[in-house]
Amino acid sequence: CPGACVCYNEPKVTTSCPQQGLQAVPVGIPAASQRIFLHGNRISHVPAASFRACRNLTILWLHSNVLARIDAAAFTGLALLEQLDLSDNAQLRSVDPATFHGLGRLHTLHLDRCGLQELGPGLFRGLAALQYLYLQDNALQALPDDTFRDLGNLTHLFLHGNRISSVPERAFRGLHSLDRLLLHQNRVAHVHPHAFRDLGRLMTLYLFANNLSALPTEALAPLRALQYLRLNDNPWVCDCRARPLWAWLQKFRGSSSEVPCSLPQRLAGRDLKRLAANDLQGC
């Protein structure tokens, strides 16, 4: 067992080295480890094959370090890995698209608060078991087409607190099991009419605190399971262009936030849902 760590076998074979001031992944981690806790250290780099000997590893916590670089092959051989927490490593900024390849059993991936500016093509390829993906509080500006295409079992996708300005047509392709999509506190001004086409099981959609002045109801039509919708804190324009959204909200049987109008000025602050159809004039 490495000097700064505590190792024990029950309930799972565990190597625990949190908050020890470690500046590198320690050598001598027992090959039988099923859980490795390295959070709260000063580790800046995860070299290739750092954990290759740990074939039984299911949980790896590397959050709250100072990671600036993760080699593409850092997690090679971890075919049984189920939880990977890389959150709160603000200097990371980018992740090689091959980093998570081969993690076919991974069900939870934490990449929040990592300073990520983009999601490289194929970053999440092959993660068919993934259920929870945490990408909130980064610096993402765009959602590339088909980024999440292989994530057919994903149920929770957290994208809030980024700088995303639009939701393109293919951003959420393949997310057939998604239950919760959090897109609040971004800069979303446009949602493609077909952006949510695959989200038939979505129950919760948060779009509050964005730059939306309109939302095509064609985008909402596929959301047959939707129960919770938050649209507040957007600059909604409540003229004739809002009539389709107004009509959709009248029929919506789930729980929705207020939708306060910003324009026209005579309707500023009033809830779109509570307006009469003939209030929505002027086109």
Partner: antibody
Framework: QVQLQQSGPGLVKPSQTLSLTCAIS????????AAWNWIRQSPSRGLEWL???????????DFAPFVQSRIAVNPDTSKNQFSLHLKFVTSEDTAVYYC???????????IWGRTMVTVSS | DVVMTQSPSSLSASVGDRVAITCRAS??????LAWYQQKPGKAPKLLIY???TLESGVPSRFSGSGSGTEFTLTISSLQPDDFATYYC?????????FGGGTKLEIK
């Protein structure tokens, strides 16, 4: 007669926060019909709307996307005024800054105040 | 953003002339358009709102027309006080945006 009187430093250092106040007379910042705006003008960028605050049973804010990450517009009901705070300023933020009222019936900006702000070390 | 394009950018005319300034929106803005007059060292002054409604106290020689994407400010008979810069502004969409201005000068 509604009037807007601006106050604040005319010179701000780069990377600091630009803070301006607009005092309202003849109307109320918590009026249920008006909105209170900040606009700026420079030779290179022309007239630019920055953001606004208004009260309709609760306070609302709207901001221009290009300044959204560094702007705050705050009402002060006790002094009947509202303020602009623009963080991390650069020379690009050198401009004439206006506060302006947006009256209730979709009329544009009918009352304006004015002050010049230079960003320089 | 809705881009407001004014033409011409400058215009020389004489007292008594009839002049027209055009403002084009990059997308439809209904009649949510205002016109302003600005003189050096002063704040803009509201002339017209809702494309064609004259602001209280503004002389009737000023008029506005248009809807959708094409708008015009007309001054029927120029007076010495009218030489200034004129701006259009849309308030149909966020962010609110202004035209680049038309400077009206004495010929």
């Amino acid at each position: 007669q509604v009037q807007l009187q601006q106050s604040g430093p005319g010179l701000v250092k780069p990377s600091q926060t630009l803070s301006l106040t607009c005092a309202i007379s003849g109307d109320s910042v918590s009026s249920n019909s008006a909105a209170w705006n900040w606009i700026r003008q420079s030779p290179s960028r022309g007239l630019e709307w920055l953001g606004r605050t208004y009260y309709r049973s609760q306070w609302h804010n709207d901001f221009a996307p290009f300044v959204q990450s560094r702007i705050a517009v705050n009402p002060d009901t006790s002094k009947n005024q509202f303020s602009l705070h623009l963080k991390f300023v650069t020379s690009e933020d050198t401009a004439v800054y206006y506060c302006a009222r947006d009256p209730p019936d979709d009329q544009g900006f009918d009352i304006w105040g004015r002050t010049m702000v230079t960003v320089s070390s | 953003d809705v881009v407001m394009t004014q033409s011409p950018s400058s215009l020389s005319a004489s007292v008594g002339d009839r002049v027209a300034i055009t403002c084009r929106a990059s997308q439809g803005i209904s009649n949510y358009l205002a016109w302003y007059q600005q003189k050096p060292g002063k704040a803009p002054k509201l002339l017209i709102y809702k494309a064609s409604t004259l602001e209280s106290g503004v002389p009737s020689r000023f008029s506005g027309s248009g809807s959708g994407t094409e708008f015009t400010l007309t001054i029927s008979s120029l007076q010495p006080d009218d030489f200034a810069t004129y701006y259009c502004q849309q308030y149909s969409n966020y962010p609110l945006t202004f035209g680049g201005g038309t400077k009206l000068e004495i010929k």
